[in-house]
Interface confidence: medium
């Protein structure tokens, strides 16, 4: 049997059974989670799930540019330290900075200080770039 | 079919303070950050600062930092610009401009004129 | 970060034009590149967001396009009309500021 592999929408790009779409667009992370999801098809912001999920966008984002944050789908609803992915993806696979997670940063970015490999925890409000990620 | 209608033309004397707004409609105003433009006659577009409609945070470009203030009003679905201290050279058009998902800035207001003269 | 734009391009009706943009620092690839039209007397309208797509109503004869290696972006405007002829400004955005270019004005002869 000849299996296909599903298409994305214009724009995204394919690994491992997901779509994703990053967008170099300012939006605060609310607003990027609301945008992610008008794109149909359920998307969210991105949850990364693996080392190699990891990788695969990382260098997918640097091919545009390396200096910029960008936002992804975890974040800490209740404002203590529970993190949680917005698509609902267990939150087991962890990449944080290492930096202080404390003050008011409630929202996850790739960082961009290690290639977008590590997370940091940014405050919500903020404008930044933003990943989209569906199952087709 | 979504509209920005902007107040009407202005003329201040040095020193003086402006406030202009931009009206919405056609859409959910609070969902979506206005941003303003400036246009100096005979010159190129300035950016000049972006209001978020959901709660009056705003950003504004270095050089108007501290001195214009961005605003709005929920219930009359309106943003305001107000620039204090004057100068001849802020006489320009001034234009409010919606940013929208996935198209920014396709919806733009049709400008007011502010002359600064004494 | 600054976009430098040529001050004037023309053309004949019918045949192709392209206004170039060019980002003074890091990559014009960041972030996305709009580009707006604006005729005498009137306001700006959007002919191209998001590096190469165009809002509705607005011709294919339109596109845009962004070239890494010389890291500029470029508006391309075929079969040239007599409409086109007008003011058109490139955009982008640096962080959380907005960056325009200084503007082309395009003569169609």
């Known amino acids: 049997d000849i299996i296909m592999r599903p298409s994305c929408a214009p724009g995204w790009f394919y690994h491992k059974s997901n779509c994703y779409g990053y967008f170099r667009k300012l939006r605060n992370w609310s607003d990027a989670e609301l945008e992610c999801q008008s794109y149909g098809n359920g998307a969210h912001l991105a949850s990364i799930l693996s080392l190699k999920e990891a990788s695969t966008i990382a260098e997918y984002i640097s091919g545009y540019q390396r200096s910029q944050p960008i936002w992804i789908g975890l974040h800490d609803p209740q404002k203590r330290q529970q993190w949680q992915w917005i698509d609902g993806a267990m939150y087991l696979y962890r990449s944080w900075s290492g930096k202080s997670m404390g003050g008011n940063k409630h929202c996850a970015e790739m960082s961009s200080n290690n290639n977008f490999l590590t997370w940091s925890s940014n405050e919500c409000n903020k404008r930044q770039h933003f990943l989209c990620k569906y199952r087709p | 079919q979504v509209q920005l209608v902007q107040s009407g033309a202005e003329v201040k004397k040095p020193g003086a303070s402006v406030k202009i707004s931009c009206k919405a409609s056609?859409?959910?105003?609070?969902?979506?950050?206005i941003h303003w433009v400036r246009q100096a006659p005979g010159q190129g577009l300035e950016w000049v600062g972006i209001?978020?409609?959901?709660?009056?945070?705003?950003n504004y470009a270095q050089k108007f930092q501290g001195r214009v203030t961005l605003t709005r009003d929920t219930s009359a679905r309106t943003v305001y610009m107000e620039m204090n201290s004057l100068r001849p050279d802020d006489t320009a058009v001034y234009y409010c401009a919606r940013e929208g998902v996935g198209a920014t800035w396709v919806h733009w207001g049709k400008g007011t004129l502010v002359t600064v003269s004494s | 970060f600054m976009l430098t734009q040529p001050h004037s391009v023309s053309g004949s009706p019918g045949k192709t034009v392209t206004i170039s943009c060019t980002g003074s620092s890091g990559s014009i690839a960041s972030n996305y590149v709009q580009w707006y039209q604006q005729r005498p007397g009137s306001a700006p309208t959007t002919v191209i967001y998001e590096d190469n797509q165009r809002p509705s109503g607005v011709p294919d004869r339109f596109s845009g396009s962004i070239d890494r290696s010389s890291n500029s972006a470029s508006l391309t405007i075929s079969g040239l009309k007599t409409e086109d002829e007008a003011d058109y400004y490139c955009q982008s955005s640096d962080t959380m500021f907005q960056v325009f270019g200084g503007g082309t004005k395009l003569t169609v002869l």
């Open positions: 209001i978020n409609p959901r709660g009056d945070s705003a």
């Open positions: 056609g859409y959910t105003f609070n969902r979506y950050y």
